[in-house]
């Protein structure tokens, strides 16, 4: 569901509403059982009280049943993500029933009208589920509702209205406008299914947040902080500015939730993991890479049910495209300084060398500011599996690389001409892998040479006392 009110004009101008020609009463919600992976196949339309299509189309009563629920739309045609999701579900769960909930007539409206229609669509789904429950062997526990944008709240209504409890609801970037801060019965909530997991990919604290910011499930996962998604910047999306508008960026970020879910279905060998954290800033600092007490989980289809948690916020970094998996590392660096290092924060980079591969030069992102004579924590991530870490190189970007730094160097020199040099002492770096939970300590090769200044580099090798390891096996063996 793209942006409701975009830069291209008022919503009304974007809609080409059908002329009112009410010649027959037709259902506004259709249930299409996708009986084939072939998009050309018409599938089977299911309707309450008509058992024949269930038999004709080999509806598997004992298998999992997925209901895919689209969101608000500016067109009368399905968006492209739907085909990808249906195809991925068929690939992963070959015996499952995959049902597309087509509510286009009610979704292709002004956004506010579409919001007002979500309740009736949820009711239609609940009626379908109540009817299916009358059949032998059909279990509500095997039902998984997957709703995108406005469709996530439709799924919430369906879960709320159905007799019994559906097994799972996945909210893919649930819509924000008119739902942020709403009562739990008027939006997706953890009460709507036995397990409610949510992916938030377009949340904004300024301007209009297309996706809901607040946690609404048992677990709420915020990839890349839930806002700026890699590969969705203007340059990435448009190739060149001439080829599109900001609307495409919005679509890219909002829809990323769907593609992360598809990725979890088709790239089972590359599962992405999220880590519980109170907020995005703490995660960016690298504080939250723990798997103790169920503090980490797979994302998407492979998420492990955690019913004891409610509104548990989890975070992860991702790549710009499929497969989205990255490898997270926490770096704990004790920085000591004998002299005043000036106002500027050091621009530090780390390169990790592993048994499988070496990383690129990774920036140590300073979320707030570096504390001197204290242990600083950083989060870095790599796109490839490095294997066991062997050594690392820390570099301090020289003044020549940055005009800003050059100016600050000059300013520092003027303010303290007697002591212009900036020097940090770093004797060891403790590294923890998010994915394996292994901890290793790296030391400078020569303890007497542990200082670093702008333009210099410092090498670290595994400390002589070897690996400092907890959890010899990965906690994810049982999750994957």
């Amino acid at each position: 569901s793209p942006v409701p009110f975009g830069p291209e004009g008022r919503l009304e101008d974007k809609l080409h509403k059908p002329k009112a020609t009410q010649t027959e009463v037709k259902p506004s919600v259709r249930f299409n059982l996708r009986t084939s992976k072939d998009p050309e196949h018409e599938g089977c339309y299911l309707s309450v009280g008509h058992s024949q299509p269930l038999e004709d189309c080999s509806f598997n009563m004992t298998a999992k049943t997925f209901f895919i629920i689209h969101g608000w739309t500016m067109s009368g045609i399905f968006e492209n993500w739907l085909h990808k999701l249906v195809s991925a579900l068929h690939t992963r769960e070959k015996d499952a029933n995959v049902v597309v909930v087509d509510w286009l007539p009610l979704a292709h409206q002004l956004y506010t009208d579409a919001v007002n229609n979500t309740r009736v669509v949820g009711h239609s789904i609940a009626r379908m589920l109540d009817w299916l429950q009358e059949k032998d062997d059909f279990s509500l526990g095997n039902v998984h509702l997957i709703g995108y944008s406005l469709g996530a709240h439709v799924a919430g209504y369906a879960g709320n209205f159905v007799k019994g409890t559906v097994g799972r609801i996945t909210g893919l970037d649930p819509a924000g406008p008119m739902f942020e801060g709403a009562d739990i019965h008027k939006r997706l909530s953890p009460d709507d299914a036995d397990f409610v997991d949510v992916l938030h990919t377009y949340t904004r604290s300024f301007g209009l947040s297309i996706g809901i910011q607040m946690p609404v499930g048992h677990i709420d996962i915020y990839p890349n902080g839930g806002d700026f998604q890699p590969g969705c910047g203007l340059n990435d999306v448009l190739g060149s500015i001439a080829y599109g508008t900001i609307t495409e960026v919005v679509k890219c970020e909002h829809e990323r939730a769907v593609h992360l879910f598809v990725d979890s279905l088709v790239n089972q060998d590359k599962p992405s993991f999220a880590f519980q954290c109170t907020d995005s800033n703490r995660f960016k600092k690298g504080i939250c890479l723990s798997c103790r007490k169920n503090r980490c989980n797979n994302i998407g289809y492979n998420a492990k049910k955690m019913r004891k948690k409610r509104n548990s916020k989890m975070y992860l970094k991702t790549r710009a495209g499929m497969p989205f998996k990255v490898y997270h590392y926490q770096l704990k660096v004790h920085m000591f300084s004998y002299n005043n290092s000036g106002d500027t924060q050091p621009t530090l980079y780390i390169t990790l060398y592993g048994s499988n591969a070496d990383s690129q030069n990774l920036p140590l992102e300073i979320v707030e500011k570096i504390e001197l004579n204290a242990t600083n924590t950083f989060l870095v991530y790599t796109e490839e599996d490095l294997g066991d870490l062997l050594k690392m190189r820390l570099t301090w970007e020289g003044v020549a690389h940055s005009w800003y730094n050059l100016w600050n160097e000059f300013r520092n020199y003027l303010s303290q001409p007697s002591n212009p040099s900036r020097e940090l002492y770093i004797r060891r770096i403790r590294v923890k892998s998010g994915e394996t939970q292994r901890k290793v300590t790296f030391c400078t090769q020569d303890p007497t040479k542990s200082s670093i200044s702008p333009g210099q580099e410092l090498w670290f090798h595994k400390c002589q006392d070897g690996w400092k390891m907890k959890n010899k096996t990965s906690p994810f063996v049982n999750l994957a």
Epitope: P39, G76, F78, N80
Partner: antibody, heavy 119, light 107 residues
Framework: EVQLQQSGPELLKPGASVKISCKAS????????MHWVKQSHGKSLEWIGG????????TYNEKFKDKATLTVDKSSSTAYMELRSLTSEDSAVYYC????????????WGQGTTLTVSS | DIVLTQSLATLSVTPGDSVSLSCRAS??????LHWYQQKSHESPRLLIK???QSISGIPSRFSGSGSGTDFTLSINSVETEDFGMYFC?????????FGGGTKLEIK
């Protein structure tokens, strides 16, 4: 057998309007979207827009939204495209094409309607 | 709008040769790319859908590959009936767009 039968060639003067028809048979008309494509002489193809016959919802290429209007008549399984304020730039072959369930690919095409706009 | 570039406007081949036609998208379109053949004074005909899915009734010598931004239509051992125009089309985002076409002609 799926068939899309389009109306015959048209020769019109600038400023006029025309309504091209596309009669569908061999499948459930309301279950698939219908799309319209323009092909100017010796040129590539341009997507004009698509319509969902089930309820009449449309989406248009911004370039054609002031030029074309898509409609359907479900009782006769016919899709229509009206082109208005015709100019010589509108001279082309126009095709209707049946979308797949998701509306992405077009396995069936009409034979094309040639429109000539000339004073 | 997504721009599809078919870099070769014309490709001259001898019957029996194998040939690859390319289509490049201006941004990632995943597998939402379809190939059509059009002969003179005829309607386009779908050859491959969703990058690599075959179409019933289309000879097996036609195959498609690619994902993201780079796509290829391969014809294994070209036959005389294969000569004509070839277009790629994307359905990743609106407006749907077509490539400029590649003319396959007899050498």
């Amino acid at each position: 057998e799926v068939q899309l039968q389009q109306s015959g060639p048209e020769l019109l003067k600038p400023g006029a309007s025309v309504k091209i028809s596309c009669k569908a048979s061999g499948y459930t008309f309301t279950d698939y979207t219908m799309h319209w494509v323009k092909q100017s002489h010796g040129k590539s193809l341009e997507w004009i827009g698509g319509i969902n016959p089930y309820y009449g919802g449309t989406t248009y290429n911004e370039k054609f939204k002031d030029k074309a209007t898509l409609t359907v008549d479900k009782s006769s399984s016919t899709a229509y495209m009206e082109l208005r304020s015709l100019t010589s730039e509108d001279s082309a072959v126009y095709y209707c094409a049946k979308g797949d369930y998701y509306g992405g690919s077009y396995n069936y095409w009409g034979q094309g309607t040639t429109l000539t706009v000339s004073s | 709008d997504i721009v599809l570039t078919q870099s070769l406007a014309t490709l001259s081949v001898t019957p029996g040769d194998s040939v690859s036609l390319s289509c490049r998208a201006s941004q990632d379109i995943s597998n939402s790319l379809h190939w059509y053949q059009q002969k003179s004074h005829e309607s386009p005909r779908l050859l491959i859908k969703y990058a690599s899915q075959s179409i019933s009734g289309i000879p097996s010598r036609f195959s498609g590959s690619g994902s993201g931004t780079d796509f290829t239509l391969s014809i294994n051992s070209v036959e005389t009936e294969d000569f004509g125009m070839y277009f790629c089309q994307q359905s990743n985002s609106w407006p749907y767009t077509f490539g400029g076409g590649t003319k396959l002609e007899i050498k």
